[in-house]
């Protein structure tokens, strides 16, 4: 913490400005008022104070808003958002796209991602769900941060705004977050033809259920491996030899290259060794022929 | 424009490990695997492994097993490769190379990173 | 694993020339799964063909791929001055992956 000190009357500050940064870091604390520095916040940005300095003006608005920063303050920050932590970020209340483009911005190319993410929820809280304005900010100035919202933020998405999101948006989510987002997905573009919805469908399959992949494959998708392998685990495995291959279509190849990989090589696993001999492409490690496969889970839920 | 750029140029000493960087730009990141081969001074390719960037998933070449590791960082379009208890027959030229999903062509490459390791 | 072979190991050919490098593998290798690449001194590999005989984006005509089984052909039909280089055969139709040793076509 800084040394409290009396201000030098000669140092005295009555507005922000490039003279500060030639006050060390007593000085500021001493001679700098945290009311005048927050309603003059807007100036912050264009002086080329130290990141010690900064930690000084952090400090003041700290001790003058002990519950959070207003959204007047926080929207100014430039530079300064820099210096807070999560714990910072989560006592904000934020509504404004300004507020946070602006963070957005500043953030870039720095290792913020905790403190973006946390930003982002704390946007999504104030403005009571995740609606198209939002989406279009993060996918326009943030590719990727949709996926650090939680899957119960991430419900708060209307099926109606699933359209604004782009596939590079959902690089980043992992299968719980798909989970929430596929079955809006689906809602949202289920008035459109087989092949046209296969193209909007295709980045949030990670979350479809083997009943939705099974009719894709009914619908000669061609869907390729890199769609393939991102499907979950449980709804690839039930999947026939021949509905995968209808599945795929010419990129059935593809798996021969895969096989060493999850959920080719569990679903290889599960299948008849006849059944993948079909396919001509040298998979091996199936079911041997004349072996009978006991489902003991079954059995156990019977006993 | 499509580009994996590498981390530079590494000298190690026997028994230490090193860790390459490959950042990808200009592509859909999940939808390539990451694959790593090396190329000894003078001497031709030889795969060493690769990492589904969707799952995290990896395959190893067996003549590297439990001395490579391989890892990414989807947020930062980052794969890394992690090489091990480091002998003088690592002293290479490690590149990371695209491959689409469900092929097995690499068609974009790395710059290379040169790793030496001598005492 | 898949051993591949490759012959010559140097190609000594004079601009203009045909160019006929060999990738012979120790098992049957499925065709979809053969590819090429061309390495220059201090530059990294760059994939010329893939699938045994499709030409990789960028990749002038004058180089074409062919082969079945084991065996398998990369021709380039006139050698111009920037194809002297290594050019290495390399098969995913078996783990792990291999390359073959190269072969190097030099100016005679």
């Known amino acids: 913490d800084v040394e409290r000190t009396t201000c030098p009357p000669e140092k005295e500050v009555h507005e922000i400005d490039e003279s500060l940064i030639f006050y060390k870091k007593r000085e500021l604390e001493a001679c700098v008022d945290a009311a005048l520095l927050a309603a003059q916040m807007d100036r912050v940005d264009a002086i080329p104070f130290t990141y010690e300095q900064l930690d000084v003006l952090k400090h003041k608005l700290d001790e003058l808003y002990p519950q959070g920063y207003p959204e007047s303050v926080i929207r100014h920050l430039g530079h300064l958002f820099l210096k807070m932590s999560p714990e910072d970020i989560r006592k904000w209340n934020v509504t404004s796209l300004e507020t946070l483009k602006a963070l957005l911005k500043v953030s870039k190319g720095h290792e913020m991602s905790a403190q973006v993410a946390t930003l982002i929820d704390r946007v999504v809280v104030g403005r009571g769900q995740l609606d198209k304005d939002t989406v279009d900010t993060l996918t326009a100035f943030c590719p990727g941060c949709l996926c650090s919202l939680s899957p119960e933020r991430l419900s708060s998405v209307p099926p109606s705004v699933i359209g604004a999101v782009r596939p590079q948006d959902l690089d980043t989510c992992g299968p719980r977050q798909l989970d929430v987002l596929y079955p809006k997905a689906r809602l949202a573009f289920q008035n459109m033809s087989g092949s046209e919805y296969f193209v909007k469908i295709r980045p949030f399959l990670g979350g479809a259920p083997t009943e939705d992949v099974k009719a894709l494959s009914q619908q000669n998708v061609s869907m390729d491996l890199a769609t393939f392998m991102k499907l979950r685990r449980e709804a690839v495995l039930p999947l026939t030899v021949a509905e995968v291959q209808k599945l795929l279509g010419p990129h059935v190849e593809g798996l021969k290259v895969e096989e060493q990989h999850s959920p080719v090589r569990d679903w290889i696993l599960k299948q008849r060794q006849d059944d993948l001999d079909t396919l001509g492409l040298g998979l091996q490690g199936g079911i041997p022929n004349g072996y009978l496969i006991l489902d003991l889970s079954v059995r156990e839920a019977l006993s | 424009e499509v580009q994996l750029v590498q981390s530079g140029a590494e000298v190690k000493k026997p028994g230490a490990s090193v860790k390459v960087s490959c950042k990808a730009s200009?592509?859909?990141?999940?939808?390539?695997?990451m694959d790593w081969v090396r190329q000894a001074p003078g001497q031709g390719l030889e795969w060493m492994g690769d990492?589904?960037?969707?799952?995290?998933?990896?395959i190893y070449n067996q003549k590297f097993n439990g001395r490579v590791t391989m890892t990414e960082d989807k947020s930062a379009s980052t794969v890394y490769m992690e090489l091990s208890s480091l002998r003088s027959e690592d002293t290479a030229v490690y590149y990371c190379?695209?491959?689409?999903?469900?092929?097995?062509?690499?068609?974009?490459w790395g710059q290379g990173t040169t790793v030496t390791v001598s005492s | 694993e898949i051993v591949l072979t490759q012959s010559p190991a140097t190609l000594s050919l004079s601009p203009g020339e045909r160019a006929t490098l060999s990738c012979s593998a120790s098992?049957?290798?499925?065709?979809?799964?053969l590819s090429w690449y061309q390495q220059k001194p201090g530059q990294s590999p760059r994939l010329l063909i893939y699938?045994?005989?499709n030409l990789a984006s960028g990749i002038p005509a004058r180089f074409s791929g062919s082969g079945s089984g084991t065996d398998y052909t990369l021709t380039i039909s006139s050698l111009e001055p920037e194809d002297f280089a290594v050019y290495y055969c390399?098969?995913?139709?078996?783990?792990?992956?291999?390359f073959g040793g190269g072969t190097k076509v030099e100016i005679k």
């Open positions: 190379a695209r491959r689409r999903i469900g092929t097995g062509y690499f068609d974009v």
């Open positions: 200009g592509y859909t990141f999940t939808d390539y695997n």
């Open positions: 990492i589904n960037p969707s799952t995290g998933g990896t």
């Open positions: 098992s049957s290798v499925i065709s979809s799964y």
């Open positions: 699938r045994t005989s």
């Open positions: 390399h098969q995913w139709s078996s783990f792990p992956y291999t």
